[in-house]
Structures are given as C-alpha cells and as structure tokens.
C-alpha cells in the first residue's frame, strides 16, 4: 500500500477511535481534560487531568527499524487497548501527561523511545512511509 494511503488510513482510524472513546467516557468539547488527538505520528485517546496515557511505538518505526525488538504489544486497531499493560520502562513505549494546561509533549520523544536509527538506509524508500 502507498505510504500516503497508510498515513491517511491510520489518521482516519484514529479519529474513529477518538469518537468512540469520547462516547464511552462521556467527553465533549466543554469537558475538562485533554481531547484525543492524532499528532501526525500516532493516536492519543482522550484523558482526564492527571492521567498519563501510554502508547506503543507506531508501525512507522518498525519500517525504519525492522530489526528493532519491542517488549510491548501493539495497541489494538479497533480500540485504544489496555494501556495498563504498558510500562514506561519498556522500550517502545511513549507517554503523554494530561495536565490542566493540556497535553505534555511525548516522553520520551519518539526517536528515543522507539530506537530510531538516523543512518539506516538514508535514501531508502521507507523515508516516505510517513514523510512523503
């Protein structure tokens, strides 16, 4: 599948997941907390203030780093999965905190969490998985 299609498909799936999560959690535009979002890399579910959300590294990094091994399972496609089964000490896990000021930046940043190798196939086609 062409990279743009994968990108758009993941984004569309994310927006659907967020909508379902909003319904489940009773979230609306005026609710306190952090709205679910697609950050152009991965999908973040809505969260209450004080909540830390954990996600597995997105598929993007598996393409950049095919030899990278993650100890955590991928979050399911049909929902946000059980983030309780993820641990920040695991390689391949990224977190964001929901604060009264909104979402924090990812911790660790994606490259550090997901084992990005900047010298891997610098001109290879996989550059364009998301980056085209």
């Amino acid at each position: 599948m062409h990279s743009d299609c994968i990108f758009k498909k993941e984004q569309a799936m994310c927006l659907e997941k967020i909508q379902r999560a909003n319904e489940l959690m009773g979230f609306n535009d005026s609710s306190p907390g952090c709205p679910g979002m697609w950050d152009n890399i991965t999908c973040w579910k809505p969260a209450h203030v004080g909540e830390m959300v954990l996600v597995s590294c997105p598929e993007l990094f598996r393409i950049f780093n095919p030899d990278q091994v993650w100890e955590t399972e991928t979050i399911g496609e049909s929902d946000f999965g059980d983030s309780n089964s993820l641990d920040l000490s695991d390689m391949g896990v990224v977190s964001r905190n929901c604060t009264e000021d909104g979402w924090s930046e990812p911790f660790p940043h994606y490259f550090d969490a997901c084992g990005f190798d900047e010298y891997e196939s610098e001109t290879g086609d996989q550059d364009y998985y998301y980056l085209s």
């Epitope: 950050d39 152009n40 905190n97 940043h109 994606y110 490259f111 900047e118 610098e122 550059d127 980056l131």
Partner: antibody, heavy 120, light 107 residues
Framework: QVQLVESGGGVVQPGRSLRLSCAAS????????MHWVRQAPGKGLEWVAV????????YYAESVKGRFTISRDNSKNTLYLQMNSLRAEDTALFYC?????????????WGQGTLVTVSS | EIVLTQSPATLSLSPGERATLSCRAS??????LHWYQQKPGQAPRLLIK???QSLSGIPARFSGSGSGTDFTLTISSLEPEDFAVYYC?????????FGPGTKVDIK
Amino acid sequence: QVQLVESGGGVVQPGRSLRLSCAASGFTFSRFAMHWVRQAPGKGLEWVAVISYDGGNKYYAESVKGRFTISRDNSKNTLYLQMNSLRAEDTALFYCARGYDFLTGYPDYWGQGTLVTVSS
Amino acid sequence: EIVLTQSPATLSLSPGERATLSCRASKSVGRSLHWYQQKPGQAPRLLIKYASQSLSGIPARFSGSGSGTDFTLTISSLEPEDFAVYYCHQSSRLPFTFGPGTKVDIK
C-alpha cells in the same frame, strides 16, 4: 557528520524584516524537527521556535508569536526564519538546531549562529 | 510557560574540585530536562538528556539526576576545559524554555 550553517543575519532597522536560512547536511533532514534558538549579546539562550519534520506543526515562544514564522524546504535541506516587525530586543545570535524527533525533540546538534542586530 | 531557575548564577572552583549545579522548574517536567555546555564563542553542546542519560562522546565525569521540578548536574572532578556556562532545557511543555545558565569559572 551533522552540519548546520546559518546565514541571513545583518543590521536592520526597527520595524523592518529579515529572513534567516539554515543549510543542513550530514543527516536525513526530512526526518527531523528543527529549532531556532537565540542568544542576546552576553545573555543566556532563548528558545524561539520549532517545526516538525514535514512542516505540519509549528510552535513559537510568546515573545515572537505573530512576528516570526518558521518554515522549511525539505527538497533543499533548508530551514528558514522569517522575522517581521523587528525590535531592538530581537538583537541576538540566532542558532538553528536539529530536534531529535519527528515532532519537536530537544536540540542535539547546533550551527554556529548568525548575528542579527536591530538598530536605528 | 515553564520557568527554569538555575543556581548558583556563578560557581567559582578549582580544577579537580566537584561542581554541583541546580535547575528548578516552576512546574513538573517529569524527566524531560536536558543539560548543555557552552564555551565562549561556541555553540551549545548537549551533555545529558532526560535528566540523567549520558551521551556518547561526553566524559563520564558529567552526570545528572532529578525528576519533576528539581534537577542536578554534577561534574565529579573539574578539568580545565569544563569551565564554561551550563544551561538546563525542558522539552516537556511548549513553549520550550532554557534556564538562565550557571557560569563555572576558575577560582
């Protein structure tokens, strides 16, 4: 090796505009976020702006919001900072730095800077 | 925005002595706190990432600790080339910010 070379600095009058450039080499530019950080003479570092790998996300310090615009041309491996309505307090050495991430990251490699002097 | 405060502003020490630099954040930044060294006429250099993670090429005498709002950079035994200005930087919340710096000079 990673190399970042800033250009476009100079002396400019208050209220005028200037565009800084940063030429990147030694890494896959299109995969990395990029930052601008400035340093007034004899002062500390001040974070100015960051742009994500594809230019889709841009964030600014309050002191420059609405006046400065960060942009990039991945086909030319070049980062830009368009500075409008310049003030005396914008006088500084402007560094471009690579962000170690797709989205923002922390600056890990820095250029040598280009000096902007705002004076009448 | 998150304000970073560094202390002391200046630290006067002799080569071989231990340097302890402090950085305090106005709100929790978790461990998204990084340390930079800047020598006169040079660009900053990344020393420590995520409060305590060392980087290749950085001497082992540099170490970091802390989380939340209080962080420390320690130089176990100062070498002549370590006399410089040190900045902390948070990448937890936008807009990102730097501390005002601590100058380590020769006593």
